[in-house]
């Protein structure tokens, strides 16, 4: 006669907190004589799931009539599945005997896996921004997830990224994973208005992966580039001094203005022009009188961006040789 | 052919452990329960307990619970059985017994050859 | 525990006889006995399962008989090798009890 055989056609099964789950095992034979029992795991400690005979099973009904004489289908089904119930299950033919059963052959096991989605990414950037050409990380977490299968990719402005790490955790068996993935993104210039995506994948979400983002302006200072003009006045003892800050990110700037050395003005930055690619431009005048000047005047424009160091630039004003000579006059 | 080898006699002292093995071979190990039996000189036959060599699951008989431990080694199809806190009326041949797979009643068709343990200070 | 009486303890006998060996249990066992030979310095030998199943490769000669708490082992025409010591074995209950023995020897 044919050897029995212990058939449980899933290796696999993912379930969601709450649903039901149903087991598969069928047999090929009627023989030995003896019950079918149902076990989550192996070894001594193995847990009974199922007993038709004897013990009050409340969330497990049979799929057949166990009762009928020629049933092979010794399925079950678990309801109001909770995280707990994750494991191995295994149908189990014993040989009657007394004083007890005799275990005679095991199924290969189907292995209930937590069907849970993973929750939002959440997109985080670095400490403290950087300057163009920089390398910054950005790192996207996930977590909740089962089974740990699961894909996360990395997009700059919708280009796919490649240089990142990535790793789930536990590594081993859980009711639930979460993803950890670091990206190194190197910063232009027009980065301000750039955006960073993570993207995550996973069976439980039908193919819709899950998105989050992290603008690169958080992660950006574009210092200003400096530029002094001077222009005389029509009246012809006064220079406009125009002092342009331009292409700077974030708007936070303050200006201060020295004469030879001497504090003259300080201003914050306000009334911004903004550029397309999100950098701000200011411009700041300084009017000079020159009438009452006998030397060279060194006129210097300090500018302080984000809470970097200052960043100073000057210019000469050179005062005639007709006015350094009233000049000389006026003090003999 | 099925035989079940046990190991070598030992002697200990009064408060010791012995640990007896059985290697199987012939037939599939996980496939037949394992049960010890021993036998005290001129004297009749007393069970100890059994294991499942598939689960690791064991039945000891109340008299030995907690004084024996029997485990198993499936890569070497091998059965162990430790009994601790000697005394000297635990001096017996110790049987390892295969669980015959017609029976109903739980009957042994296969021995090992037996394992002298004498007990002595 | 169940425990088992054998009777008689021993007996003698001589070659080609009739030997009827019993077995009483303390409760009934249904026909959960078995009975196994022993010879001297040799582990066990099973004979009968069932109460009344002869075991692959054991003679003919040898039958076990009854149900509930009396069984018989009977060997219908004694043959030297069978002089040995013969043990009923309940298998109802746990623990699982041997009954003392019954030694068979030539008259």
């Known amino acids: 006669e044919e050897e029995l055989q212990m058939i449980q056609p899933e290796k696999l099964l993912l379930v969601a907190v709450g649903e039901s789950a149903t087991l598969n095992c069928t047999v090929t034979s009627l023989l030995p004589v003896g019950p079918v029992l149902w076990f989550r795991g192996v070894g001594p400690g193995r847990e009974l799931i199922y007993n038709q005979k004897e013990g009050h099973f409340p969330r497990v009904t049979t799929v057949s009539d166990l009762t009928k004489r020629n049933n092979m289908d010794f399925s079950i089904r678990i309801s109001s599945i909770t995280p707990a119930d994750a494991g191995t299950y295994y149908c189990v033919k014993f040989r009657k005997g007394s004083p007890e059963n005799v275990e005679f052959k095991s199924g290969p096991g189907t292995e209930m896996a937590l069907r849970a989605k993973p929750s939002a990414p959440v997109v985080s950037g670095p400490a403290a921004r950087a300057t163009p050409e920089h390398t910054v990380s950005f790192t996207c977490k996930s977590h909740g997830f089962s089974p740990r299968d699961i894909t996360l990719k990395w997009f700059k402005n919708g280009n796919e990224l490649s240089d990142f790490q990535t790793n789930v955790d536990p590594a081993g068996q859980s009711v639930s994973y979460s993803i950890r993935s670091t990206a190194r993104v190197v910063l232009a210039p027009w980065d301000v208005r750039s955006q960073v995506t993570c993207e995550v994948a996973h069976v439980t979400l039908q193919g819709d992966p899950l998105r989050g983002t992290a603008n690169l302006s958080e992660a950006i200072r574009v210092p200003p580039t400096l530029e002094v003009t001077q222009q005389p006045m029509r009246a012809g003892n006064q220079v406009n001094i125009t002092y342009q800050v331009r292409n700077f990110y974030p708007q936070n700037l303050q200006l201060t203005w020295l004469e030879n050395g001497n504090v003259c003005r300080t201003e914050t930055a306000s009334t911004l022009t903004e550029n397309k690619d999100g950098t701000y431009n200011w411009t700041s005048w300084l009017l000079v009188n020159t009438s009452d000047q006998r030397d060279d005047v060194v006129l210097t424009c300090q500018v302080k961006h984000d809470g970097q160091l200052a960043v100073n630039k000057s210019l000469v004003l050179e005062v005639s040789a007709h006015q350094k000579d009233q000049s000389s006059d006026a003090t003999h | 052919q099925v035989q079940l080898v046990q190991s070598g006699a030992e002697v200990k002292k009064p408060g010791a452990s012995v640990k007896v093995s059985c290697k199987a071979s012939g037939y599939t190990f996980t496939r037949n329960y394992v049960h010890w039996v021993r036998q005290a000189p001129g004297q009749g036959l007393e069970w100890m307990g059994r294991?499942?060599?598939?689960?690791?699951?064991?039945n000891t008989a109340q008299k030995f619970q907690g004084r024996v431990t029997m485990t198993r080694d499936t890569s070497t199809s091998t059965v162990y059985m430790e009994l601790s806190s000697l005394r000297s009326e635990d001096t017996a041949v110790y049987y390892c017994?295969?669980?015959?797979?017609?029976?109903?009643?739980?009957?042994?068709?296969?021995w090992g050859q037996g394992t002298l343990v004498t007990v002595s200070s | 525990d169940i425990q088992m009486t054998q009777s008689p303890s021993s007996l003698s006998a001589s070659v080609g006889d009739r030997v009827t060996i019993t077995c009483r249990a303390s409760?009934?066992?249904?026909?959960?006995l078995n009975w196994y030979q022993q010879k001297p310095g040799k582990a066990p030998k099973l004979l009968i399962y069932?109460?009344?199943s002869l075991e692959s490769g054991v003679p003919s000669r040898f039958s076990g008989s009854g149900s509930g708490t009396d069984f018989t082992l009977t060997i219908s025409s004694l043959q030297p090798e069978d002089f040995a010591t013969y043990y009923c074995?309940?298998?109802?209950?746990?623990?699982?009890?041997f009954g003392p023995g019954t030694k068979v020897d030539i008259k």
């Open positions: 069932d109460a009344s």
């Open positions: 294991i499942n060599p598939n689960s690791g699951g064991t």
């Open positions: 074995q309940q298998a109802n209950s746990f623990p699982l009890t």
């Open positions: 409760q009934s066992i249904s026909s959960y």
């Open positions: 017994a295969r669980l015959g797979d017609v029976a109903v009643a739980a009957s042994f068709d296969y």
